[in-house]
């Protein structure tokens, strides 16, 4: 294309082509003609004396690029009840739907919208949600490694560490937190048979622990005296 700006339509010089981005070559007219901008379509093609005539796309229709389309494209149908609309249908872009929380996209469209959402898998007790996702976006579960646990069935909960106890009553395992012995002024005087209920872990107070490979000894072991449950809070 010559260096100077040339108004369409024009006949390209030998060895030159039309500007690809905003022009097209009309074989019938044998001219370089203007494409229509995003949001419009070709109402009338060009001829040797007059350029392309463009018109706005109608409601629920769009064109996203400079084009020589005879009609605008139809926007995708409305998002389903398990989806959220993250981009509305306009004259210049298609509607984009994404899966609501707790679901993943099992079938994507070429435009990046989601055609079919599926409920995320849940990881059961002893398993936590892995930091990476499956190729299809579903949750991956991983077994809680020693020193960590998950006592929930969830698509979001990760394995978290056992609490560190001042006095440990029952060691934690992959599906339960460590149980700490409660503080009592009489503990040192009374041999203790443990009836310690499992504290309900909460998001705001994950736990502390220390570990090692244990062949879990008898839970009725005498526990020594005095201590307090030391809980911890998640940093940040």
């Amino acid at each position: 294309v010559p260096a100077q700006v040339v108004l369409t339509p024009y006949k390209p010089e030998p060895g030159y082509e039309c500007q690809i981005s905003q022009e097209y070559y009309d074989r019938k007219a044998q001219m370089c003609c203007a494409k229509c901008p995003p949001g419009q379509y070709v109402k009338h093609f060009c001829n040797k004396t007059s350029d392309t005539v463009c018109a706005d796309c109608e409601a629920s229709m769009y064109t996203q690029v400079w084009n020589q389309f005879r009609t605008c494209l139809s926007c995708s149908s409305s998002c389903t009840t398990d989806q959220v609309e993250i981009r509305a249908c306009t004259k210049q872009q298609n509607r984009v739907c994404a899966c609501e929380a707790g679901r993943y996209c099992a079938l994507k469209t070429h435009s990046g919208s989601c055609r079919q959402c599926m409920r995320l898998s849940k990881c059961g007790p002893g398993f936590g949600v892995a930091s990476s996702r499956a190729p299809n976006g579903n949750v991956l579960c991983k077994a809680c490694a020693p020193g960590t646990f998950s006592d929930t069935t969830s698509s979001t909960d990760v394995c978290r560490p056992h609490r560190i106890c001042s006095i440990l009553a029952i060691p934690g395992n992959a599906s339960t937190d460590a149980v700490c012995a409660p503080e009592s002024p009489t503990l040192s005087a009374i041999p203790r048979t443990l009836y310690v209920s499992q504290p309900e872990p909460t998001r705001s107070q994950p736990l502390d622990q220390e570990p090692g490979p244990s062949q879990t000894p008898s839970i009725l072991t005498s526990l020594g005296s005095t201590p307090i449950i030391e809980q911890s809070t998640k940093g940040g």
Epitope: A145, P146, G147, T148, R160, P161, H162, I164, C165, S166, I167, L168, P171, G172, N173, A174, A178, D208, Q209, E210, P211, G212, P213, S214, Q215, T216, P217, T221, S222, L223, G224, S225, T226, P227, E230, K234, G235, G236
Partner: antibody, heavy 129, light 110 residues
């Protein structure tokens, strides 16, 4: 709860020494690992070994400490660290520290979360001629 | 052998400022990382475990983060009492990997 080390001394190279860690306010046999960590003057921390204080008394050592250092549980409230063939490089404050155990299911012989949450004040061992 | 590389060796901060200490493991330790604070003449104190969990009584100005081989301790709103040496520790021990401490970072508060 507290831990206290004893037995630190000035000894000559080539000799042996036994350090004792005494627990107060809790029973060593209650699901704890008792560990030893040392710190040379003005230097960083160096893990030595741990012993599972319950029944089996399983131990694990830093590779450099195997053979020369031995941990054991002598009672429900005491653990010891025996050190042999001492050299000047062993001069350090020796701390005992504890970490608690957990069930490991299939993870036989594996210890992961060795978090030392309770420490003694330390005892100084000086090896010098 | 697992090596924990801690940087910087020393850092100075004004009261109210922020201190960042980095710890790099020579292999993936899967968040099994602890941070300790040690003051002269005292034993270390466990501040943070499993990379980001604060132990009981530790002020919320201490924050641990990181995963894999890279970990960070951040102290926001530094106070005079925070002057100490801080150590990271890989709490990952297995049949072929030993727990190891970083070299320490001295925090000086101006």
């Amino acid at each position: 709860q507290s831990l206290e080390e004893s037995g630190g001394d000035l000894v000559v190279p080539g000799t042996s020494l036994t350090l004792t860690c005494t627990a107060s306010g809790f029973d060593l046999s209650s699901f704890y690992y008792m560990c030893w960590v040392r710190q040379a003057p003005g230097k960083g921390l160096e893990w030595i070994a741990c012993i599972y204080a319950v029944s089996s008394g399983s131990t694990y050592y830093a590779s450099w400490a195997k053979g020369r250092f031995t941990v054991s549980r002598t009672s429900s409230t005491t653990a010891t660290l025996q050190m042999t063939s001492l050299t000047a490089a062993d001069t350090a404050t020796y701390f005992c520290a504890r970490h608690q155990s957990y069930e490991t299911y299939g993870y036989v012989g594996v210890v992961y979360a060795t978090y030392f949450s309770l420490w003694g004040p330390g005892t100084l061992v000086t090896v010098s001629s | 052998a697992l090596v924990m590389t801690q940087t910087p060796a020393s850092v100075s901060a004004a009261v109210g400022g922020t201190v960042t200490i980095n710890c790099q493991a020579s292999e993936d330790i899967d968040s099994y990382l602890a941070w300790y604070q040690q003051k002269p003449g005292q034993p270390p104190k466990l501040l943070i475990y499993y990379a980001s969990y604060l132990t009981s009584g530790v002020p919320s100005r201490f924050k641990g983060s990181g995963s894999g081989t890279e970990y960070t301790l951040t102290i926001s709103g530094v106070q005079c009492d925070d002057a100490a040496t801080y150590y990271c520790q890989s709490a990952f021990y297995s049949n072929n990997t030993e727990t190891a401490f970083g070299g320490g970072t001295e925090v000086v508060v101006k």
